[in-house]
Interface confidence: low
């Protein structure tokens, strides 16, 4: 097997258990809504839209795990009981009963709108995470970029795009400035809370999307 050697940062090794690592003939799934007439998939069928979204979320979750590892190693935020103090200042997206994503009262369309809206709201917080990591700089970028791709996939799946509210750029810009102006302890806490909340949001999304 030919191995690629890495330069610059360590490899972005978000190991996905389901990845096929084939030295010679890589399969070639095609994302939803994109035709690939040129690529042959010799060993298996292209991924369906749902499978692709599922894998994309798990890929992001692996990235979050890598970032959380650095955060927890760097500070004691992961054991801190003062989270509530900082959490009050953050308006991080959360799943609620009314969003239709839980088993009781499940509503596919309402839930999908919530997932997309929530991801769009998380984007400013993911922007904040950039420059917050030393050894995991590329993981932080990967989580941000992969979330953008996930949003694109989900928007293709959604029928009711009008119901999706996009965050106001001016509000986001001032929020970002405010977050970056916090003292070091609050910045560390904010980083920890963003990662934890985003992980929980994605896990809830993953469960809901598997029912769709």
């Amino acid at each position: 097997m030919n191995s690629f050697s890495t330069s610059a940062f360590g490899p972005v090794a978000f190991s996905l258990g389901l990845l096929l690592v084939l030295p010679a003939a890589f399969p070639a799934p095609v994302p939803p809504g994109e035709d690939s007439k040129d690529v042959a998939a010799p060993h298996r069928q292209p991924l369906t839209s749902s499978e692709r979204i599922d894998k994309q979320i798990r890929y992001i979750l692996d990235g979050i795990s890598a970032l959380r590892k650095e955060t927890c190693n760097k500070s004691n935020m992961c054991e801190s009981s003062k989270e509530a103090l900082a959490e009050n200042n953050l308006n991080l997206p959360k799943m609620a009963e009314k969003d239709g994503c839980f088993q009781s009262g499940f509503n596919e369309e309402t839930c999908l709108v919530k997932i997309i809206t929530g991801l769009l709201e998380f984007e400013v917080y993911l922007e904040y995470l950039q420059n917050r990591f030393e050894s995991s700089e590329e993981q932080a970028r990967a989580v941000q970029m992969s979330t953008k791709v996930l949003i694109q996939f989900l928007q293709k799946k959604a029928k009711n795009l009008d119901a999706i509210t996009t965050p106001d750029p001016t509000t986001n810009a001032s929020l970002l400035t405010k977050l970056q102006a916090q003292n070091q302890w609050l910045q560390d806490m904010t980083t920890h809370l963003i990662l934890r909340s985003f992980k929980e949001f994605l896990q809830s999304s993953l469960r809901a999307l598997r029912q769709m």
Epitope: F4, A8, F9, P11, L19, V21, E137, A142
Partner: nanobody, 128 residues
Framework: EVQLVESGGGVVQPGGSLRLSCAAS????????IGWFRQAPGKEREGVSC????????YYADSVKGRFTISRDNAKNTVYLQMNSLRPEDTALYYC?????????????????????RGQGTLVTVSS
């Protein structure tokens, strides 16, 4: 429509250089890893190099390490493969692929993650 178009191939003498280009369109280059593969007649496809999205971590096959350099220009939506000190065994059809993911693969082993688009390729012949 997503497209990858390679160019820059040709005939070169051993020890010579070539610069391959992979022009991408229909998607944002910074969101995806781009890899170069090659396939020589009668041989298996081989991963040559890969560059991950945005920050641009690079990976190289052992056979080309120190001779080939991959780079990207997000503004031009193009990835380049600079090939120096070319050898007869580098003769192959070279093509670029877009990874389904942002990074190049599991711990940089081959392209690792599935790719979803590839170009038609550009032929490189190293011969005296």
């Amino acid at each position: 429509e997503v497209q990858l178009v390679e160019s820059g191939g040709g005939v070169v003498q051993p020890g010579g250089s070539l610069r391959l280009s992979c022009a991408a369109s229909g998607f944002t280059l910074a969101y995806y890893a781009i890899g170069w593969f090659r396939q020589a007649p009668g041989k298996e496809r081989e991963g040559v190099s890969c560059i991950s999205g945005s920050v641009g971590t690079t990976y190289y096959a052992d056979s080309v390490k120190g001779r080939f350099t991959i780079s990207r220009d997000n503004a031009k939506n193009t990835v380049y493969l600079q090939m120096n000190s070319l050898r007869p065994e580098d003769t192959a059809l070279y093509y670029c692929v877009r990874s389904s993911w942002f990074d190049c693969g599991v711990q940089g082993r081959d392209l690792g993650n599935e790719y979803d688009y590839r170009g038609q390729g550009t032929l490189v012949t190293v011969s005296s």
